[in-house]
Every structure is written in structure tokens, then in C-alpha cells.
């Protein structure tokens, strides 16, 4: 982790002041994946490259933040820079982040991830949602998403809200949730694996 953030910062620091402003304005209108909010205009326009990098990572996390940055750079005509950013981001990204067990061979086969296969059961049966949120915060959940899930009144509605963000996740992000579930409610995961 940190590689994507450094690559974003390197790109933004190489823009002129006027290009950085152009970047911010385009960021205000760039299409976003479902479940992600916009950085407020007032805050955005007052940021320097370092502040903006940190905000991009806290709002969109490293991988999507880098993808979004590359999209905006491309829209500004900076195709080569966008390519360099994505190349830097993808270097070494084949390995799962530290602390994540590699998925079992069955999960590596094409098809649905465990958490997608058992979505309905997880919504109905997960009770320790707060623990999951803490485990996912800053890794796959932005501050805004974290707060949105916590604001829900019941565990099923919390889980439903959490699942509303998963379409934007890759396999590794879903593995993080699975790992958190194994640690907090291992019996539930084992039960679902047997079913």
C-alpha cells in the first residue's frame, strides 16, 4: 500500500498551478462509480497537490483514487502521464495486501465470490457489523461509506448498505471482507461454506 498514493502525488505535483485547478474542476464532474461521493467543491478548490492526494485516497481509496486521477488526466489530454500513473499503481499489485490470506482454490475459479454467493444469508445472519466496519475502514471503505453503514438502524440494513458498495470492489477487496468475517463470525462462514 502507499504506491498508488505516491504515484497520484507525483502526477499532481508535476502539473502547473493552472493545470491543477483544471484537474480539480474536471474532478467535480467526472462520472463516479456507484457508492462514491464527490469531494465538496469548496474544500477541493482550496487544496494543494498534497492535500488533494490525501483527500482522493481517503474518499476513493488508493486503487480507485488512482484510476479516477488517471481518467481526469486523460480528459485533460495528458494520456502519457495517465498511463505512467496506472503503470506505477499496478506494479506489484498482483499480490494481495499484507495480512490477507490467498483465497482458496475453489474461490479462484471464475464465478461469484463467496460474499456474493451468500449475500442474502450474510445480510440476515451477520451480527457483528461494527467489527467488520472497523476492519474494512481505510482499506475498502471510505469515511463517507463507513458513516453511511453505521447510520443504518439494524444489522440487516447495515449489511444491505455495506453490500451496496461491493459492486465497485475487486476480488481482493471482497477477500478482505471474507477475512474479517472469518475472524469475527467463523462459525457462520464455516456453515455457509458447507452449504
Amino acid at each position: 500500500m502507499g504506491r498508488a498514493r505516491d504515484a497520484i502525488l507525483d502526477a499532481l505535483e508535476n502539473l502547473t498551478a493552472e493545470e491543477l485547478k483544471k484537474f480539480k474542476l474536471k474532478l467535480l464532474s467526472v462520472p463516479l462509480r456507484e457508492g462514491y461521493g464527490r469531494i465538496p467543491r469548496g474544500a477541493l478548490l482550496s487544496m494543494d497537490a498534497l492535500d488533494l492526494t490525501d483527500k482522493l485516497v481517503s474518499f476513493y481509496l488508493e486503487t480507485y483514487g488512482a484510476e479516477l486521477t488517471a481518467n481526469v488526466l486523460r480528459d485533460m489530454g495528458l494520456q502519457e502521464m495517465a498511463g505512467q500513473l496506472q503503470a506505477a499503481t499496478h506494479q506489484g499489485s498482483g499480490a494481495a495486501p499484507a495480512g490477507i490470506q490467498a483465497p482458496p482454490q475453489s474461490a479462484a475459479k471464475p464465478g461469484l465470490h463467496f460474499i456474493d454467493q451468500h449475500r442474502a444469508a450474510l445480510i440476515a445472519r451477520v451480527t457483528n457489523v461494527e467489527w467488520l466496519l472497523d476492519a474494512l475502514y481505510g482499506k475498502v471503505l471510505t469515511d463517507e461509506q463507513y458513516q453511511a453503514v453505521r447510520a443504518e438502524p439494524t444489522n440487516p440494513s447495515k449489511m444491505r448498505k455495506l453490500f451496496s458498495f461491493t459492486p465497485a470492489w475487486n476480488w481482493t477487496c471482497k477477500d478482505l471482507l471474507l477475512q474479517a468475517l472469518r475472524e469475527s463470525q467463523s462459525y457462520l462462514v464455516e456453515d455457509l461454506e458447507r452449504s
Epitope: 502547473t16 493552472e18 493545470e19 485547478k21 474542476l25 478548490l45 482550496s46 495528458l78 502521464m81
Partner: antibody, heavy 117, light 112 residues
């Protein structure tokens, strides 16, 4: 239509200050940088500085640091340039220009400042 | 500070002629990451505001006639007018924005 309207000509005494305005229409100044450029009679263009109206951040050419001050009033979509401790060397036309991220694509008509006792 | 040098300081031409003027910077204006040269060309007619012709050394501003061409990279740049018209008589300034902003002293284009 994008326009930058500058204040009228000014005749000022040595040692005094002058405040020039540049009012934008057709765009929001917060979305751009506004630059100021000085041109003395029969001379070339000299960059004074730039302001980011969204946050008030400024950059000046070192020779105008302390001499010129740029401020912004977003409510009226206006940027101001104040030039202080005027001498005959400050007699010039001052232009404001909009930088849209590519370059200075629109300019005001210029304000003539004459310093004379 | 980046110093911009323009040559010649003045140029007398006849209508229809091809003209070239040059601009040199004291350091490279090429940003290796953005691959852009932060050099622009402006035209200023007497009593008027400057008008942007070319930015990023070679990109013609929309609406500028294609007889105006910018070229060069790094420290050496050229503005070419392929067939000079009477309305092209003006002073031409190059300007760097790689580090803050500096204008060249200008090249005055006059009728022979």
C-alpha cells in the same frame, strides 16, 4: 460571452496608491487563475503576478513583491490589483488576463495609470 | 528566474512572404512528465490587449488562422507565419509558464 472589464484610467500622485479592478462576466473567476501584466509606454510586457480567486493564493514576480497586491471579491466576480508607493516607473497600462488551464485566453482592455505630480 | 530572449527585435516584410521569429529560454521549458513545453506566443497590435496565438509551443488556439505555426522544444522555439497578411503587423511575444511567468522582449513585424 467571456469578458474581462477593467476600471478606467487613473492619474495619481507620486507616493500614493492605486487600486485597479478587473470584473469578469461569462465565467466564474473561481474556476480560473487571474494574471496581471504591466506594459510601460512603448515597452514590452512584464508579468506582475497571479491569483487563485478560489482561495486567495497569490504568486508575484519578485520585482513586484511588496509593490503590488492582488485580492479577490468572489461575490462580485472581481479581482483587484493595488500598486503602492507609486513612482514614474509605475506609469503603465495594466492588463488582467484569464488563465483557463491552457493559457491566457482572454484579456481585459487594460487600465492606464499615469503617475504625475 | 527564467530569461526569455527573442530575435530579431524587428522584422520588415512584404505581404505574402514567409516569416520566422525565434525565442530562446535560459532553461528547458519541457516538463518530462506532462510532455508539454510551457511556451506560448502572443500577438499585440497598437492600442490593443495581447492575443493568444499558440500554447504548449505548438498548439494553435481555436480561431487562429493556420498560417501561424509554433514549433520547437526544450529551449529553442520558433513562430512561423507562412504568408504574412497586412493584419499580421504587430509585436509578437513569447512567454514561458514553466516556472511562474516571463515574457520575451518581443519581435516587431513591420511592412517593408
Amino acid at each position: 460571452e467571456v469578458q474581462l472589464q477593467q476600471s478606467g484610467a487613473d492619474l495619481v500622485k507620486p507616493g500614493a496608491s492605486v487600486k485597479l479592478s478587473c470584473t469578469a462576466s461569462g465565467f466564474n473567476i473561481e474556476d480560473t487563475y487571474i494574471h496581471w501584466v504591466k506594459q510601460r509606454p512603448a515597452r514590452g510586457l512584464e508579468w506582475v503576478g497571479r491569483i487563485d480567486p478560489a482561495n486567495g493564493n497569490t504568486d508575484y514576480d519578485p520585482k513586484f513583491q511588496g509593490k503590488a497586491t492582488m485580492i479577490t471579491d468572489t461575490s462580485s466576480n472581481t479581482v483587484y490589483l493595488q500598486v503602492s508607493s507609486l513612482t514614474s516607473e509605475d506609469t503603465a497600462v495594466y492588463f488582467c488576463g484569464r488563465h483557463d488551464g491552457y493559457d491566457m485566453d482572454y484579456w481585459g482592455q487594460g487600465t492606464s495609470v499615469t503617475v504625475s505630480s | 528566474d527564467i530569461v526569455m530572449s527573442q530575435s530579431p527585435s524587428s522584422l520588415a516584410v512584404s505581404a505574402g512572404e514567409k516569416v520566422t521569429m525565434s525565442c530562446q529560454s535560459s532553461q528547458s521549458l519541457l516538463n518530462g512528465r506532462t510532455r508539454r513545453n510551457y511556451l506560448a506566443w502572443y500577438q499585440q497590435k497598437p492600442g490593443q490587449s495581447p492575443k493568444l496565438l499558440i500554447y504548449w509551443a505548438s498548439t494553435r488556439k481555436s480561431g487562429v488562422p493556420d498560417r501561424f505555426t509554433g514549433s520547437g522544444s526544450g529551449t529553442d522555439f520558433t513562430l512561423t507565419i507562412t504568408s504574412v497578411q497586412a493584419e499580421d503587423l504587430a509585436v509578437y511575444y513569447c512567454k514561458q509558464s514553466y516556472n511562474l511567468v516571463t515574457f520575451g522582449a518581443g519581435t516587431k513585424l513591420e511592412l517593408k
